[in-house]
């Protein structure tokens, strides 16, 4: 039976959520964001072997064609399936405002 | 001025919609699909340089962190932004049925 969550490459090698610690400078935000000063960025990293966390039919097609034509068709890619929102305190022309971004932090991952 | 659709790597090198001609056998569908016998598969292929077709804030973050930590954080990846539906005539235990798939053919692409 196919197991879409068992990584055939070994633990932690396949597409999954990682956390990367980053400063405002790292993110290129220092000139427009005041807070937070540091962000625990959650993002999707890892390989997408056959049948692993396939997002949809398109991912299945892509994998099959990648196996046939690896120089033409890339393997599916590990990307966010959904996001967690985050509030930023950002600089404006007149001071600061609160702005919530819905597409900033990955919540879970799949292969497309 | 930033242009999210101008490829700095040269024409056709960046993330865009490609069409790949595939048979049912190529797709691994020969045992369950009757028609179509061949599919013009539209998929997203190409590089995602900085600021090119960035899907969202997460893609911007990923690119900035990739430049800082290329061994840890991969570049954004070219994936479908939306899909075109497609109908398949598929085999069933008793004969055939029509089934529409909403997530089979890429319609347009972006970098995530």
């Amino acid at each position: 039976a196919r197991n879409g969550d068992r990584c055939p490459l070994g633990p932690g090698r396949c597409c999954r959520l990682h956390t990367v610690h980053a400063s405002l400078e790292d993110l290129g935000w220092a000139d427009w964001v005041l807070s937070p000063r540091e962000v625990q960025v959650t993002m999707c990293i890892g390989a997408c072997p056959s049948q692993f966390r396939e997002a949809n039919m398109h991912a299945q097609i892509k994998m099959n064609l990648h196996r046939l034509k690896p120089d033409t068709v890339p393997a599916p890619c590990c990307v966010p399936a959904s996001y967690n929102p985050m509030v930023l305190i950002q600089k404006t022309d007149t001071g600061v405002s609160l702005q919530t971004y819905d597409d900033l932090l990955a919540k879970d991952c799949h292969c497309v | 001025a930033r242009n999210g659709d101008r490829c700095p790597l040269g024409p056709g090198r960046c993330c865009r919609l490609h069409t790949v001609h595939a048979s049912l056998e190529d797709l691994g569908w020969a045992d369950w699909v009757l028609s179509p016998r061949e599919v013009q598969v539209t998929m997203c292929i190409g590089a995602c340089p900085s600021q090119f077709r960035e899907a969202n804030m997460h893609a911007q973050i990923k690119m900035n962190l990739h430049r800082l930590k290329p061994d840890t954080v991969p570049a954004p990846c070219c994936v479908p932004a939306s899909y075109n539906p497609m109908v398949l005539i598929q085999k069933t235990d008793t004969g055939v049925s029509l089934q529409t798939y909403d997530d089979l053919l890429a319609k347009d692409c972006h970098c995530v």
């Epitope: 807070s35 937070p36 967690n84 929102p85 985050m86 509030v87 305190i89 609160l98 919530t100 900033l104 | -």
Partner: antibody, heavy 118, light 106 residues
């Protein structure tokens, strides 16, 4: 827009536990960086921070009151509860809840008056 | 804990005056200071974040400055609606407030 509404018993007897609820709208405690804090103001006096709870369920308490305070959240109901045990007359105050964005009290509720008296 | 000492505790001024309120932290709090305005019978309202940034909607006559231990809130030209009590707040450590400055009409 952001709204916060405090509710409480109004009158509490000494040695009892005070239970307060903050019902909020216009933001979500599932959003990274968001939190809700409780601050009180005794009659004619200044502001005193009591506790806060963050999106990631991290809780912080005023060290001077920590043993008497409990804060909790019900994200699905958009409610925050605060309990203050063993109350005395010194706990008579207006109790405010406030939206926190990171560490800043960006927006405050109207407050609820609590009197401790037998 | 970090003490925030505001001065003066009360102040009389006239419409059009320039007013400065100071706040001194008992230890370095970087720029992690906010200012709030509270009118009688109302809840506090955010004015300034990170020592010097006005919150959206706050009139430009309000300004903040300082870093480390010394902070000021300045109202460049007092308007009738500015007569209120002002509080500083540090959020570098667990939150503490100044004791307040009551601004009255002369």
């Amino acid at each position: 827009q952001v709204q916060l509404q405090e509710s409480g018993p109004g009158l509490v007897k000494p040695s009892e536990t005070l239970s307060l609820t903050c019902t909020f709208s216009g933001f979500s405690l599932s959003t990274s960086g968001m939190g809700v804090g409780w601050i009180r103001q005794p009659p004619g006096k200044g502001l005193e921070w009591l506790a806060h709870i963050r999106w990631d369920d991290v809780k912080r308490y005023n060290p001077a009151l920590k043993s008497r305070l409990t804060i909790s959240k019900d994200t699905s109901k958009s409610q925050i509860s605060l309990k203050l045990s063993s109350v005395t007359a010194a706990d008579t105050a207006v109790y405010y809840c406030a939206q926190m964005a990171w560490d800043w009290f960006a927006y405050w509720g109207q407050g609820t008056t609590v009197t401790v008296s037998s | 804990d970090i003490q925030m000492t505001q001065s003066p505790s009360s102040l009389s001024a006239s419409v059009g005056d320039r007013v400065t309120i100071t706040c001194k932290a008992s230890q370095n709090v970087d720029t992690d200071v906010a200012w709030y305005q509270q009118k009688p019978g109302q809840s506090p309202k955010a004015l300034i974040y990170s020592a010097s940034y006005r919150y959206s909607g706050v009139p430009s006559r309000f300004s903040g400055s300082g870093s480390g231990t010394d902070f000021t809130l300045t109202i460049s030209s007092l308007q009738p609606e500015d007569f209120a009590t002002y509080y500083c707040h540090q959020y570098n450590s667990y939150p503490t407030f100044g004791q307040g400055t009551r601004l009255e009409i002369k």
